[in-house]
């Protein structure tokens, strides 16, 4: 008898999955700019706002070069995933000055959850160690003001535009290893 | 068309060693995370390790833990698994496994009896 | 005893629906890791049927598709065909082992 049969190509394989993580990101990024700009209109911003429980930026334009494709996959992924629970949170909690926005959140909110499936599955194919995408998070609690909601979501858009900028070019560097 | 191919297979006394090997063709090996999956006769599907596309993480059930070696060569395309203090137990056919698993080998049969 | 957990059987005649059942605990499925299914026709190797809970791998009929919700996964076969008489499995990435579960497995029967 001959050699066994092969199997199909699946739908896509670890290069190809970067190459779409690299599209989503992108395309999140821009998302992002533009509600981030869209709230600034409707809510100037009275400078920069934070929030201590968004993650602290995990790169910087120095520390590119070094970049470890396990280390950035994983820190992206907790990263956004961290994003993605402040979305759910502002949209849950963040009253009725936020409900205009609710359209452009729900698709930011569908849209993160896309590209964290997709890294998922990159991480998977790659066989790299996976931290759990539901891990227990401090409980973020209602706004203390609508003013206060305002406030948060300039510092979640601002800090998931600074995420998803760095994630890009990391996520470049790192199809040049693959 | 993607191919794998298992060999190394075959009858062991109990305390045995064996190594099985995976030949890979037609897709890039090397962006792959590889696996070993068992399955004993009439009985379902058990993982058994895994490695990463570059080598750098391995992963073992319970079961093989301290017995069982995975290793990669992807520059030659090829997969391995040591088995050493081989167990009655242990008997399956053995499937090589690429990706999510995305990909499997037909399988080699493994009997471990005295 | 598998990690997963599915029905040991299901059945349907030509042209059903069928849906196979899939639960897992809170380092897998209920962790947030995707769900993949696998078809085994008897004498061959496991095939990728579905993988991230809902997408289909290229050649794979539309008559199948996934779903998951928080710690169980469904597999659904409509328009049931003789030739999907096999065993199907669930897998899922578990976060304490560093690698893939399986369920059981479900023999599927076309009546």
């Known amino acids: 008898p001959g050699p066994p049969a092969g199997s199909p190509r699946v739908s896509s394989d670890p290069r190809a999955d970067l190459d779409s993580a690299v599209l989503l990101t992108r395309s999140l990024l821009a998302d992002t700019r533009q509600l981030a700009a869209q709230m600034r209109d409707k809510f100037p911003a009275d400078g920069d706002h934070s929030l201590d429980s968004l993650p602290t930026l995990a790169m910087s334009a120095g520390t590119l070069g070094s970049l470890q494709l396990p280390g950035v996959l994983t820190r992206l992924r907790v990263d956004l995933m961290s994003y993605l629970r402040h979305v759910q949170w502002l949209r849950r909690a963040g009253g009725p000055s936020l409900k205009t926005l609710e359209p452009e959140l729900g698709a930011l909110q569908a849209r993160l959850e896309r590209l964290l499936r997709r890294l998922q599955l990159l991480m998977s194919r790659l066989a790299l160690p996976q931290a759990a995408p539901d891990q227990p998070v401090i409980p973020l609690g209602p706004p203390a003001s609508a003013w206060g909601s305002i406030r948060a979501a300039h510092a979640i858009l601002g800090g998931l535009h600074l995420t998803l900028d760095w994630a890009v070019r990391g996520l470049l560097l790192l199809k040049t290893r693959l | 068309e993607v191919q794998l191919l298992e060999s190394g297979g075959g009858l062991v006394q109990p305390g045995g060693s064996l190594r099985l090997s995976c030949a890979a063709s037609?897709?890039?090996?090397?962006?792959?995370?590889m696996h070993w999956v068992r399955q004993a006769p009439g009985k379902g599907l058990e993982w058994v390790s895994v490695?990463?596309?570059?080598?750098?993480?391995?992963y073992y059930a319970d079961s093989v833990k301290g017995r069982f070696t995975i290793s990669r060569d992807n520059s030659k395309n090829t997969l391995y698994l040591q088995m050493n203090s081989l167990r009655a137990e242990d008997t399956a056919v053995y499937y090589c496994?690429?990706?999510?698993?995305?990909?499997w080998g037909q399988g080699t049969l493994v009997t471990v009896s005295s | 005893q598998s990690v997963l957990t599915q029905p040991p059987s299901a059945s349907g005649t030509p042209g059903q629906r069928v849906t196979i059942s899939c639960t897992g605990s809170?380092?897998?499925?209920?962790?947030?890791?995707?769900v993949h299914w696998y078809q085994q026709l008897p004498g061959t190797a496991p095939k990728l049927l579905i993988y991230?809970?809902?997408e289909r791998p290229s050649g794979v009929p539309d008559r199948f598709s996934g779903s998951k919700s928080g710690t169980s996964a469904s597999l659904a076969i409509s328009g049931l065909r003789s030739e999907d008489e096999a065993d199907y499995y669930c897998?899922?990435?578990?976060?304490?082992?560093?690698?893939?579960?399986f369920g059981g497995g479900t023999k599927l029967t076309v009546l």
């Open positions: 490695i990463s596309y570059d080598g750098s993480y391995k």
């Open positions: 809170s380092s897998n499925i209920g962790a947030g890791y995707d």
């Open positions: 037609g897709f890039t090996f090397s962006s792959y995370g």
């Open positions: 897998a899922a990435w578990d976060g304490s082992l560093n690698g893939p579960v």
């Open positions: 991230s809970n809902n």
């Open positions: 496994a690429a990706g999510v698993p995305d990909y």
